[in-house]
Structure formats: structure tokens, C-alpha cells
């Protein structure tokens, strides 16, 4: 008996061939022996089986001895043994229809779990193997679970259902709702304008929700809300903003915030949250602001940084075109009685300069 696997909602063609390449009488029946379709003269006739309005045959191939049955919009309950009767012989085809669906919405927040459920006919014992867009392989039986979705899980998942050495492939599009980056750090000299950008890792036709940026300044004992906003069909409108600092926000996506100037008292880290309409949970992106200040006071040249820096970052003071430098893995460096000239303050990570500020030291007579 031939086994054919089908996908719920799809179309399948069950083949039946006569030895002689000519138009002859044929019938397709189900396992109850109820007629689905057949030929009467030159016409296709349909019996009262449940398949009658979804079954058809390729009339153009009848004179070649091909009497296939096409079943449209497959349902799990179409799984059955179908019998083709032609030239006094019977051909049996076992059709097994499977469905694979995501248990919840296919638009899920980062960190949420994804469950794929296999619908299968009674008596079948299929196995399922799924491959994520990032190349992660997951195996299972009736259900496949991905406990914590990551950004890279966004895209088309390819799942293969196997039964009786036959396979059928399903493609499921999963959208992980997240910001493109989990965290970003902006490095600025004191007084410079600061641009924060929060690009999303997905696109939705209608994007509606609300968000807030909470800020924990390094110098402050507690965090405070800097701005709250609404998002309606990708249009951004500010609800409330603090007086100090007075942030500005772009009206279009990606979410964009401007801090008029970087000051040491603003250095710190923030958490932008975005709650989307009809979704439980929130999207998060951490943003850090590191501010540098270089000053000369009497005989002391000082370079300082404020904000969340890693202990492996190096802060250096260097006289231009001279070898004279002072370097430390610290948040402040200084030179006493500095030589006259253009001094550079550099914040670097393994040789890569993250932030630089120049200060001119004039000779003292």
C-alpha cells in the first residue's frame, strides 16, 4: 500500500494509473467504500463522500490512463485509505494529513516561549524536527517547545514531519518582537548633543503601544522617568517629559531621542521599555551614556569620565606629537604641571578609541 503525506490546508494528488493509455471507467472510494468520484461516459461524477466538494481529477490525463484524485484544502480527518478501482484492479493509497501550528500568536516577545503543536491522524506516530533561522535544531513528538526566544529566532522555521520513511515539510514564520540591540552605549564629550536611537528588529503593519525611558544617573541615588510616549500606527507622540534634561523625541520610527547636551550629571544608564498593544510583556533596550570632561585648573590637567564603563577601559592623557602620556584603568587621570601644547584625553578599549577630547595647555610664564 502506497503512503502519501499531506499538509493541512494544502492540495494533494493521489495517482492511479491504468495499464492501457486510454480513457476507461474508474472510481475513487474511501475506506467505507463510499464513492468520492468517478467517470460516467465522458463526465466526472461525484459521490456523497465528505470529500465530494474538495475532490477533483485531471480530465486532460484520462486518455493517457492517468486517473488521479486531487484533494483540495486538506483536513486531518481526510487521513484515510483511498481505493482506486480501474481495469478490474484496486490500488490502495494511504493518505496521512498533518498540521503544524504555533500554539499562540507567531509574533512573540523576546524571552517568551514558542510551542509548535503537531496535529496528526489517530494511529500515526510521527517525529518532528525543526530548524530555526539561526540554525538551531529541535526535535520532538506532538509538541516542540522553545523556552526562551532570542532575536535570532526571528524568521522562517523549517519543520520536517516524518512518518513511514516519508516526510512533509512545514514552514512557519516567527517574528520575535525586540529591539535590534539589547544594549548600546553612547560616548560623548561634555556639552555635545546626544542622540539615542532604538531601532526595532521587526516590522509590523500597525504598530501601536506606549513606552517610557527610565534613567539612573551615576550621581543620583534613584532612577527617574525622563520621558513617556505613545505610539500609534508608527507615529510617536510625547506624553510627558522631565524639565531637566529636556529630551526631544522624533515623531517617526525608529524611536529617536535627543539630549541637548551631555553633562556629567546625566551620565548613567537608562532602560527604554515599549509595551505593544495586545501583547503581554514589554520590549526592553538598555542605553548607557558615558560623558568625558578634560579640564586644566592651576597646575593640574585632569581628564574624567562619568557613566557605566568597564574596568578594562583605559583612560589616557597624551601630549600631541610627544611621547608623554599617562594611562590608567580608571575613571580619572591627571598630569601635574603639564607641558604646553595640545593634550588629548582618550578613552579606549584594547587600543580602539571610544572617546577623545582635546585641551590646549598654554605656557605659564
Amino acid at each position: 500500500k502506497k503512503v502519501v503525506l499531506g499538509k493541512k490546508g494544502d492540495t494533494v494528488e493521489l495517482t492511479c494509473n491504468a495499464s492501457q493509455k486510454k480513457n476507461t471507467q474508474f472510481h475513487w472510494k474511501n475506506s467505507n467504500q463510499i464513492k468520492i468520484l468517478g467517470i460516467q461516459g465522458l463526465f466526472l461524477t461525484k459521490g456523497p463522500s465528505k470529500l465530494s466538494d474538495r475532490a477533483d481529477s485531471r480530465k486532460s490525463l484520462w486518455d493517457q490512463g492517468c486517473f488521479s484524485m486531487i484533494i483540495k484544502n486538506l483536513k486531518i480527518e481526510d487521513s484515510d485509505t483511498y481505493i482506486c478501482e480501474v481495469e478490474n484492479k484496486k490500488e490502495e493509497v494511504e493518505l496521512l494529513v498533518f498540521g503544524l501550528t504555533a500554539n499562540s500568536d507567531t509574533h512573540l516577545l523576546e524571552g517568551q516561549s514558542l510551542t509548535l503543536t503537531l496535529e496528526s491522524p489517530p494511529g500515526s506516530s510521527p517525529s518532528v524536527k525543526c530548524r530555526s533561522p539561526g540554525g538551531k535544531n529541535i526535535q520532538g513528538g506532538r509538541t516542540i517547545s522553545v523556552p526562551q526566544l532570542e532575536r535570532q529566532d526571528s524568521g522562517t522555521w523549517t519543520c520536517t514531519v516524518s512518518q513511514d520513511q516519508k516526510t512533509v515539510e512545514f514552514k512557519i514564520d516567527i517574528v520575535v518582537l525586540a529591539f535590534q540591540k539589547a544594549s548600546s552605549t553612547v560616548y560623548k564629550k561634555e556639552g555635545e548633543q546626544v542622540e539615542f536611537s532604538f531601532p526595532l528588529a521587526f516590522t509590523l503593519e500597525k504598530l501601536t503601544g506606549s513606552g517610557e525611558l527610565w534613567w539612573q544617573a551615576e550621581r543620583a541615588s534613584s532612577s527617574k522617568s525622563w520621558i513617556t510616549f505613545d505610539l500609534k500606527n508608527k507615529e510617536v507622540s510625547v506624553k510627558r517629559v522631565t524639565q531637566d534634561p529636556k529630551l526631544q523625541m522624533g515623531k517617526k520610527l525608529p524611536l529617536h531621542l535627543t539630549l541637548p547636551q551631555a553633562l556629567p550629571q546625566y551620565a548613567g544608564s537608562g532602560n527604554l521599555t515599549l509595551a505593544l498593544e495586545a501583547k503581554t510583556g514589554k520590549l526592553h533596550q538598555e542605553v548607557n551614556l558615558v560623558v568625558m570632561r578634560a579640564t586644566q585648573f592651576q597646575e593640574n590637567l585632569t581628564c574624567e569620565v562619568w557613566g557605566p564603563t568597564s574596568p578594562k577601559l583605559t583612560l589616557s592623557l597624551k601630549l600631541e606629537n610627544k611621547g608623554a602620556t599617562v594611562s590608567k584603568q580608571a575613571k580619572a587621570v591627571w598630569v601635574l604641571n603639564p607641558e604646553a601644547g595640545m593634550w588629548q584625553c582618550l578613552l579606549s578599549d584594547s587600543g580602539q578609541v571610544l572617546l577623545e577630547s582635546n585641551i590646549k595647555v598654554v605656557p605659564t610664564w
Epitope: N32, I34, K35, G38, T45, K46, G47, S49, K50, S52
Partner: antibody, heavy 120, light 107 residues
């Protein structure tokens, strides 16, 4: 056991739409096809068509242009609408269950029938 | 559509008689034929399915035979409750069609 009960107006004016509902009790409406059959007084049976819970329908070609069938699984009911009626549509209208099993296809459960008269 | 022709249209018989009704299909319907009984003011009742199989609870005096285009329905010994109208029905092809009926009356 499954029982069927037709309901609807007994009198319909010519050119109007005849509407009947069949209520299924004692069993689920799911998984079966449900037929409508009519019988003019003193005459034979005419199959109108059938519907199932997936809303698949088959209609008798002679009535197809005027027939609409619908099903409401939550109420365990299915309905028949026949538009542009004439006196020729006066009949007893039956609803019935289509049962399929091995070597068997038949209308095994019937309603008691609803008499519909088309007259102005 | 497949036409179903029953004969006779009506017949008179007595209790205890053997009665035969025939049904002819306009084309080959294999064994896809049912027989129904209908009493006045009551819905039809399925008696025989698949040309020759007795529905559960139907007395064995009722029988059916035939295949292709010619079918026969027999009551071996008429009982008072058997006086009714009998219909054949084909289910080989949609639309499902019925014979015009055979009215069985008391002689």
C-alpha cells in the same frame, strides 16, 4: 438518541424567501453532513442539498441558484433559505442526518417535517 | 442527474402476500442504493442500504437485491404495518435522487 426538529414560518408569500431551521438534540452537529429534502403533497421526495460543520455544501443543481444553507455549531442548528419562491415550492420540508460508515450511506435520522405553503 | 424509475407506482396486496418492487437507474450505480418506507404524515425511514443490507432493527421479511441499474425490493410476507409508500434512493452520484415512490395498499 439524535432528534431533529424543523422550525420556521408555515406561510410564505410568492417571490419572498423561505427560511427554515433544523435543531439537533441528543448529539453533536459536528462530523456529519445534514440534508434538506422536500415533498410536495402527494408527490415524491426531492433532495435539496446538504451542509457540514466545515460549511462545505452540496446543492441540487435544479435549485442551486436559489438555495443557501448555513450551520451554527454553537447552537447545534443548521438552516435553509430558498429565495424567489413560487407556488411550486409548497411542500413538506424535512431535515435529515447523512450517515456514512462502512458500505453505508443513508439518511438515518429525520425531522418530523415542516409544512410550508407559498401563497399571497 | 441520475433518474430513478420505480415500478409499479402503486399496488394492492393482502396480509401474508409476497410483494416485489423494482427500481431502475438511468446509469450504472453499482450497489449505491437505499430503500425507504414512508407512512402518511411521517418522515421516511431507512430500511435497506447498499442495495441488500438490512438497517438495524428492521424485520427480516424486508430484503433487497441487485446492482448496476436494476434493483429489487421484496417483502416476503406482508404485515398490516407494512402498508406504506416505498422509495428507492441512489447515492452513487450527487445530486442524490429518489424514485417517484410505490404506494402499497391493502387489497
Amino acid at each position: 438518541q439524535v432528534q431533529l426538529q424543523e422550525s420556521g414560518p408555515g406561510l410564505v408569500k410568492p417571490s419572498e424567501t423561505l427560511s427554515l431551521t433544523c435543531s439537533v438534540s441528543g448529539g453533536s452537529i459536528s462530523t456529519y453532513y445534514w440534508s434538506w429534502i422536500r415533498q410536495p403533497a402527494g408527490k415524491g421526495l426531492e433532495w435539496i442539498g446538504r451542509i457540514c460543520t466545515t460549511e462545505n455544501t452540496n446543492y441540487n443543481p435544479s435549485l442551486k441558484s436559489r438555495v443557501t444553507m448555513s450551520i451554527d455549531s454553537s447552537k447545534n442548528q443548521f438552516s435553509l433559505k430558498l429565495s424567489s419562491v413560487t407556488a411550486a415550492d409548497t411542500a413538506v420540508y424535512y431535515c435529515a442526518r447523512d450517515l456514512e460508515r462502512l458500505n453505508y450511506y443513508g439518511m438515518d435520522v429525520w425531522g418530523q417535517g415542516a409544512t410550508v405553503t407559498v401563497s399571497s | 442527474d441520475i433518474q430513478m424509475t420505480q415500478s409499479p407506482s402503486s399496488l394492492s396486496a393482502s396480509v401474508g402476500d409476497r410483494v416485489t418492487i423494482t427500481c431502475q437507474a438511468s446509469q450504472d450505480i453499482s450497489k449505491y442504493l437505499n430503500w425507504y418506507q414512508q407512512k402518511p404524515g411521517i418522515a421516511p425511514k431507512l430500511l435497506i442500504y447498499d442495495a441488500s443490507n438490512l438497517e438495524t432493527g428492521v424485520p427480516s421479511r424486508f430484503s433487497g437485491s441487485g446492482s448496476g441499474t436494476d434493483f429489487t425490493f421484496t417483502i416476503s410476507s406482508l404485515q398490516p404495518e407494512d402498508f406504506a409508500t416505498y422509495y428507492c434512493q441512489q447515492y452513487d452520484s450527487l445530486p442524490i435522487t429518489f424514485g417517484q415512490g410505490t404506494r402499497l395498499e391493502i387489497k
